[in-house]
Amino acid sequence: DGCKDIFMKNEILSASQPFAFNCTFPPITSGEVSVTWYKNSSKIPVSKIIQSRIHQDETWILFLPMEWGDSGVYQCVIKGRDSCHRIHVNLTVFEKHWCDTSIGGLPNLSDEYKQILHLGKDDSLTCHLHFPKSCVLGPIKWYKDCNEIKGERFTVLETRLLVSNVSAEDRGNYACQAILTHSGKQYEVLNGITVSITERAGYGGSVPKIIYPKNHSIEVQLGTTLIVDCNVTDTKDNTNLRCWRVNNTLVDDYYDESKRIREGVETHVSFREHNLYTVNITFLEVKMEDYGLPFMCHAGVSTAYIILQLPAPDFRAY
């Protein structure tokens, strides 16, 4: 069908609550484009009827709420005047009862669910709530070990919980809760956050921390387009460079002629006492020569790699 496939990272989500994912891919969605969502390679688009539990809302796919059976690969097709891209998003839904068990045992949790407070400082936690404009979010309540947080040192500021004079006792399992209103109906959103305490001044001293990748392999089909983010946390005043290298050479230099593999534009999100940086690497078309080669994300003195590998043959097809 002439659409270029792009594989995004997995999202691990909690059942029985709202979830939304925005189909944005800056090089493409910045212009005049149409966006259509599909599930599991279905030819039938996701409904745009706002009363549907799962529906498309502008560029978003919205689940009101998410259910256990919603796990799967969703595709959003971005069509421009002269281009077509199909972005694959793997959603995994789990049953999570925040008060029963620790969030710590879950695989691949994003940085949003693991946050750090700095001992002896004033710091904050952030409740990440990403929903389209049609969703109205009420005031956020915060919980620690399933008890609502109240006390002298805690103040709520929009999506943040301000914590004064952080102590070692502040580590643990937190949750932020908000009531989401959509088309007159109310839903509860509850995000779990595992909080650790660091004694180091600044955000981990001057050594940046690479959150992703984690020195692992990625299965990817030959000929596909692949985008991999490198997520780095570092101090706000850092002077570290972040980049992707292969064979100890900047990817933009290594693939200077073909431009088949490129480093993306760095973006960052500013937290109270650290920045979260993202710089991606784009494989426009994965070739045989890419397999088995470590693609290194560098951030100051820190490094982490990904290695592409061919998926194992699926014998069920025969």
């Epitope: 005031p139 109240k150 709520v156 706000k236």
Partner: antibody, heavy 119, light 107 residues
């Protein structure tokens, strides 16, 4: 000891920008946030906004489009600007700081500076 | 935003007598309430934080109580220097908000 002192013109014309400076001593702006509060002639107090130790800012919703807060850490100064003022902005303006171990309340205040908006 | 309502607006009391000031929050603020005292030409001065804890240097004739939505400041035996305006402030949730004040005047 911890001190904060506001300074700036006492008279501002309507539609102009009100500019104030808070000069601090006894602590570093890289360690503590500085808040701005105003008090109307009728005595009501209103929290306007804050510049955090990392330089980020937050504002009370009615002020988001009109207020700018910045700082020069080396000079121990915080700058406050309120644009498009009207006579309703006539008030005493305070800068303030929380206590070392306290929550979000103000243990230390400047002496305040009266700003009158009038043509 | 959370609205803080103080009563009465003015309280006329004789020196040596007990004074009780009230502050109500429009929603639950736990104990994140502070009382300030303000005299003419001066900045507010913190008296009681966390609803019932005296700030450093505050005489023990000042006491605070309450939680949730209802709070009280009590001055057990009024001294001449206590006649001033008193404000409550909540710091449970931004925007930080203040009561409109209670003026304590000599009867």
């Amino acid at each position: 000891q911890v001190q904060l002192q506001e300074s700036g013109p006492g008279l501002v014309a309507p539609s102009e920008t009100l500019s104030l400076t808070c000069t601090v001593s006894g602590f570093s702006l890289t360690d503590y946030a500085v808040h701005w509060i105003r008090q109307f002639p009728g005595k009501g107090l209103e929290w306007i906004g804050v510049i955090w130790s990392d330089g980020s800012t937050d504002f009370n919703a009615p002020f988001k489009s009109r207020v700018t807060i910045s700082k020069d850490t080396s000079k121990n100064q915080v700058s406050f600007k309120l644009s498009s003022v009207t006579t309703d902005d006539t008030a005493v303006y305070y800068c303030a700081r929380k206590g070392g171990y306290s929550g979000s309340w103000f243990a230390y205040w400047g002496q305040g500076t009266l700003v009158t908006v009038s043509s | 935003e959370i609205v803080m309502t103080q009563s009465p607006a003015t309280l006329s009391v004789s020196p040596g007598v007990r004074a009780t000031l009230s502050c109500k929050a429009s929603q639950d603020v736990g104990t994140n309430v502070l009382w300030y005292q303000q005299k003419p030409g001066q900045a507010p001065r913190p008296l009681i934080y966390s609803a019932s804890y005296r700030h450093s240097g505050i005489p023990d004739r000042f006491s605070g109580s309450g939680s949730g939505t209802e709070f009280t400041l009590t001055i057990s035996s009024l001294q001449s220097e206590d006649f001033a305006v008193y404000y409550c402030q909540q710091y449970s949730r931004y925007p930080l908000t203040f009561g409109q004040g209670t003026k304590l005047e000599i009867k």
